[in-house]
């Protein structure tokens, strides 16, 4: 069967929402009321990869955009980026590893570990209005815990 994608939004454990910041960057900030409409809606695809009860491989695209979160080396450091793809070919069941995140549920929070770079996670800063990035530490200052709200298509 083809890849299945479900729409969702993410908030970090401080309740910051994710919004676009320019054409190829996401930032995290607190939103309320009408401003909530600014938050990014992801199209989360269930993709091929190593799977367990607590770990599900997913790809995170931006709804109705040909942009996917991907993990690449920049200046020898694992880096999160928004990558443009050919919409005729994506999403697909067998996504390239740079697009794959292990969605890990621990207690009531979710982590998104890069499949390409184990132990590197989608992260936000404590500070407001800062870019979403790939971080190599858990449990420190930076936030790696999220909640997900599925939304109707």
């Amino acid at each position: 069967a083809p890849v299945r994608s479900l729409n969702c939004t993410l908030r970090d454990s401080q309740q910051k929402s994710l919004v676009m910041s320019g054409p190829y960057e996401l930032k995290a900030l607190h939103l309320q009321g009408q401003d909530m409409e600014q938050q990014v809606v992801f199209s989360m695809s269930f993709v091929q990869g190593e799977e367990s009860n607590d770990k599900i491989p997913v790809a995170l695209g931006l709804k109705e955009k040909n942009l996917y979160l991907s993990c690449v080396l920049k200046d020898d450091k694992p880096t999160l980026q928004l990558e443009s793809v050919d919409p005729k070919n994506y999403p697909k069941k067998k996504m390239e590893k740079r697009f794959v995140f292990n969605k890990i549920e621990i207690n009531n929070k979710l982590e998104f570990e890069s499949a390409q770079f184990p132990n590197w996670y989608i992260s936000t800063s404590q500070a407001e209005n800062m870019p979403v990035f790939l971080g190599g530490t858990k449990g420190g200052q930076d936030i790696t815990d999220f909640t997900m709200q599925f939304v109707s298509s």
Partner: antibody, heavy 119, light 107 residues
């Protein structure tokens, strides 16, 4: 044997609130996603709330969004549905159902609890 | 939302009859379809998932087929315990919606 037992239903006035509970046994509750599905008299089944195994993911359709909240206590093997601002059209039998990790089918259902919203 | 339409809404059949229930969807759901059986006053029970895979403990007289937008549930030889309501449900995109049901009654 998997068992899901709902409770907390009853008669409530429009605008009122109610909290439903679902006690789970016979399986490792903390490893399964759970949902609430309702069936109004003479109507089709309607999925009204979802929560992932640890509570990190949720879903509500537009018909109940902002009025219903779903939660779980894995230590007590219990699922909850908090229903606020109830309307006559929320009158239904409410079932809790077990789901798998990838948000697909419901493999076990409880017997249901009746919620009646009427003045 | 994907709309689910079952046909017929009800049917009368005898023990031993072959019964076919159809579920049509307003969009392509591939094989992401489930069938449930519900007896009066009881909870629904899973019969078939992924359009054609029989759930554990379901008798082999039940079978599911189809993909895309048209699906069928077949009972090859109706038994007394099969008189019930049957529902299809898709799980392709949110919200996962149900068909209106098919009531299988004794002729």
């Amino acid at each position: 044997e998997v068992q899901l037992v709902e409770s907390g239903g009853g008669l409530v006035q429009p605008g009122g609130s109610l909290r439903l509970s679902c006690a789970a046994s016979g399986f490792d509750f903390s490893r399964y996603d759970m949902s609430w599905v309702r069936q109004a008299p003479g109507k089709r089944l309607e999925w009204v709330a979802y929560i992932s195994s640890g509570g990190g993911s949720t879903y509500f359709p537009d018909t109940v969004k902002g009025r219903f909240t779903i939660s779980r206590d894995n230590a007590k093997n219990t699922l909850y549905l908090q229903m606020n601002s109830l309307r006559a059209e929320d009158t239904a039998v409410y079932y809790c159902a077990r789901q798998n990790k990838k948000l697909t089918w419901f493999d076990y259902w409880g017997q249901g609890t009746l919620v009646t919203v009427s003045s | 939302d994907i709309q689910m339409t079952q046909s017929p809404s009800s049917l009368s059949a005898s023990v031993g009859d072959r019964v076919t229930i159809t579920c049509r969807t307003s969009g392509n759901i591939h094989n992401y379809l489930t069938w449930y059986q519900q007896k009066p006053g009881k909870a629904p029970q899973l019969l078939v998932y992924n359009a054609k895979t029989l759930a554990d403990g379901v008798p082999s007289r039940f079978s599911g087929s189809g993909s895309g937008t048209q699906f069928t549930l077949t009972i090859s030889s109706l038994q007394p315990e099969d008189f019930a309501n049957y529902y299809c449900q898709h799980f392709w995109s949110l919200p996962f919606t149900f068909g209106q049901g098919t009531k299988v009654e004794i002729k």
